[in-house]
Interface confidence: low
């Protein structure tokens, strides 16, 4: 379980000057995203960043360059993956108030002026404050409304239908809001109808089972329309539940399921004392037997650069459920010894999605991985290759002498993905070789001298250059450089007959 | 056989952006030994560089042209994209797109931009 | 930025002709010089790499020379297919930069 992320400023509320800049930071043990008050489109002068740091946290910066009324809000930030449609946000906030002496109130979307109460709850008139001090009153028709304000939310308490307008005073300015309107929803004469599939995937020899459930209403006809109908394949049964409120729960059950039972199935339910219909469908697939497909959002040969955070991301559409698993070099994948982690989460009732991450890329991460999905009925894998890009490094720089000829070889060993270049440069005045001019580059047509390059593997390249004599003590170059950096290392190359009365001194 | 696409619109208006997109096929934008470049040709002028992309998004541009020039890259479509703003007459030539690794092996056949008002 | 100055700017050759086109550079930029053809209305193609190396299907006439700053593509026995604009490219140093062309024409 992931802590909460962190804010800083570390407060739960903040008022921020008037067309100031604010920055706000969000740390997190995993991707961290914001939501804040704007919409997309008014959110121009919004900007967030992902920044880097040392701490092993992932740090997302929200950035407003010129802060204005409408920046009054809950700005809340929440890991990535916890986010679901239905849920409240799971996160941090912070609540940021922009004063403005001409803008009272936060401006508000046309929806937010009609406030719906259900029965006798209670409801929120959403007029809030850009300045968490400003003095607030709430008025009907009929005058002041006792009702508790908070300016993050605005009025809470239980209102009667019709027009409320808030007002505030401003530096003895007086500012109202055009009205908010309230209105109730009852429990309607339309029928309210409900259909429930746990399931809408199945295989042969199954037991699809589908239910209807009607609310409020004890005089109803509701008729079953399904593939297998008109053989009388379906058993259907009625169950009424009357605690906490009337309740008639119609279930259709079709067992020994096969293929030609795939199709939509409907329940239309007819109020018996009014002409009122309602219909509901469901689309059931029953295979003939369990499958896998899987589908990555990725090709089969991966590139990532040293020390880059990435994810691989598949998906996976099976029946029955399975079991998913990862490979390293046909390995299985043991997270804890590695920066790499793999997730599984279901995404609607086939599909699934899993997740390879690379925390910090290593060079020893590149290799051939493979995910495997399966279960009773089938077996899938997708293998992919992924390469971690690294700068050019030269290995080693060695020379080679040829005996009595005179001649030398001098080989020059780099790694580096993609695969680096070799370039060889000489400088003949020993003396001078501090001086960046004194070298020049080696030709290829250069009679007596020849030069070759070979690669060893995917990511090691080997490069020759053979002088037939050397007649003074020289110095090599060799330079190793791809797309993503470059190094250079030097050797001397003294002379056979040098190196002789070397040895004899 | 690696094929290269250019598409956009021919006539562009002085002062607006400029887009043109490359699509690749016979081929993955995503291979790691290669980079995606922009390279342009006034009428009856010499090539300049415009720009190039990796597939992870890393970015190179001419510095004549890097205030005005976005490229980004759409490896689930398997194509990549050149943006050139506030344009003017002297941005009228024929725009390639490119493969190359050092070298610009394979060109697509050119698409022509004229800004005119 | 690496200015890379073609000479001639223009040759009138007649048929099975060699041809010389040098590339001269601004700077040493070792061996990662390339020549490109283009014929009208068509883009160019690499035809040498790193100065002499001729890219896969490229005819054995066409040959690449040279290193440091000076660079030469020669075309031995010319054809008449060979009519063309002749571009040399640099890619050591960003931005990377092309010669200003050199056009060949056929008798």
């Known amino acids: 379980q992931l802590s909460l992320p962190s804010i800083l400023p570390n407060e739960n509320e903040k008022v921020v000057q008037l067309n100031s800049s604010f920055s706000l930071r969000c740390f997190g043990e995993s991707e961290v995203s914001w939501q804040y008050p704007m919409s997309e489109e008014e959110s121009s002068d919004v900007e967030i960043r992902n920044e880097e740091n040392n701490s092993g946290l992932f740090v997302t910066v929200l950035e407003v360059s010129s802060a204005s009324a409408a920046h009054t809000g809950l700005y809340t930030c929440y890991y990535n993956h916890t986010q679901t449609e239905e849920n409240e946000l799971e996160g941090r906030h912070i609540y940021i108030y922009v004063p403005d002496p001409d803008v009272a109130f936060v401006p508000l979307g046309m929806t937010d002026y009609l406030v719906i109460v259900e029965d006798d709850d209670s409801a929120i008139i959403p007029c809030r404050t850009t300045d968490p001090e400003t003095p607030v009153t709430l008025h009907n028709s009929e005058g002041v409304v006792p009702a508790s304000y908070d300016s993050r939310q605005g009025f809470n308490g239980t209102f009667t239908v019709g027009p409320y307008i808030c007002e505030a005073t401003v530096k003895g300015k007086k500012f109202q809001t055009i009205p908010f309107n309230v209105y109730a929803l009852k429990a309607t004469s339309e029928l309210d109808l409900e259909m429930e599939a746990l399931k809408t995937v199945y295989k042969s020899g199954e037991t699809i089972v589908v239910t209807c459930a009607v609310f409020n209403n004890e005089v109803v006809d509701l008729q079953w329309t399904y593939p297998g109908e008109v053989k009388g394949k379906g058993i259907t049964m009625l169950e009424e539940i009357k605690v906490p409120s009337i309740k008639l729960v119609y279930t259709l059950t079709v067992p020994e399921a096969t293929v030609k039972d795939s199709g939509d199935y409907e329940c239309a339910a007819r109020q018996a004392t009014r002409e009122v219909k309602e219909m509901k469908k469901v689309t059931i697939s029953v295979h003939e037997k369990g499958f896998i497909e899987i589908k990555p959002t990725f090709s089969q040969l991966e590139a990532v650069n040293l020390h880059e955070v990435k994810h691989f991301v598949v998906e996976v559409r099976a029946y029955p459920p399975p079991r998913i698993s990862w490979l390293k070099n046909n390995l299985t994948l043991i997270e804890n010894l590695t920066e790499i982690t793999t997730d599984v989460e279901k995404i609607q009732e086939i599909r699934y999605r899993s997740k390879l991450k690379l925390i910090r890329a290593k060079e020893e991460d590149s290799g051939h991985y493979t995910i495997v999905a399966q279960n009773e009925d089938a077996v899938k894998s997708y293998t992919f290759e992924l390469l971690t890009q690294v700068p050019s490094s030269i290995l080693d720089l060695v020379d080679d002498h040829h005996g009595s000829t005179g001649g030398q070889t001098v080989r020059c060993t780099a790694e580096g993905t993609p695969l680096p270049d070799i370039e060889w440069m000489i400088c003949k005045d020993i003396k001078k070789c501090n001086n960046e001019t004194s070298w020049t580059i080696l030709a290829n047509n250069v009679s007596n001298i020849i030069t070759e390059i070979h690669s060893r593997d995917r990511s090691t390249v080997e490069g020759r250059v053979t002088f037939a004599k050397v007649e003074e003590t020289i110095a090599v170059r060799c330079l190793a450089k791809n797309l993503l950096g470059a190094e250079n290392r030097e050797l001397k190359l003294v002379a056979p007959t040098l190196r002789s009365e070397l040895t004899v001194a | 056989q690696l094929q290269l696409q250019e598409s956009g619109p021919g006539l562009v208006k002085p002062s607006e952006t400029l887009s043109l997109t490359c699509t690749v096929s016979g081929g993955s934008i995503s291979s790691s030994n290669y980079y995606w470049g922009w390279i342009r040709q006034p009428p009856g002028k010499g090539l300049e560089w415009i720009g190039t992309i990796y597939y992870t998004g890393s970015t190179y541009y001419n510095p004549s042209l890097k205030s005005r020039v976005t490229i980004s890259v759409d490896t689930s479509k398997n194509q990549f994209s050149l943006k050139l703003s506030s344009v003017t007459a002297a941005d009228t030539a024929v725009y390639y797109c490119?493969?190359?690794?050092?070298?610009?092996?394979?060109w697509g056949q050119g698409t022509l931009v004229t800004v005119s008002s | 930025e690496i200015v890379l100055t073609q000479s001639p700017d223009f040759l009138s050759v007649t048929p099975k002709e060699k041809v010389t086109i040098t590339c001269r550079a601004s700077?040493?930029?070792?061996?990662?010089l390339h020549w490109y053809q283009q014929k009208p209305d068509q883009s160019p193609k690499l035809l040498i790499k790193?100065?002499?190396q001729s890219f896969s299907g490229v005819p054995s006439r066409f040959s690449g020379s040279g290193s440091g700053t000076d660079f030469t593509l020669t075309l031995n026995s010319l054809e008449a297919e060979d009519a063309a604009t002749y571009y040399c490219?640099?890619?050591?140093?960003?931005?990377?930069?092309f010669g200003q062309g050199t056009k060949v024409e056929i008798k």
């Open positions: 790193y100065a002499s």
């Open positions: 490119a493969r190359h690794h050092w070298v610009f092996d394979y």
């Open positions: 490219h640099q890619s050591t140093i960003l931005p990377w930069t």
């Open positions: 700077q040493i930029i070792g061996s990662s």
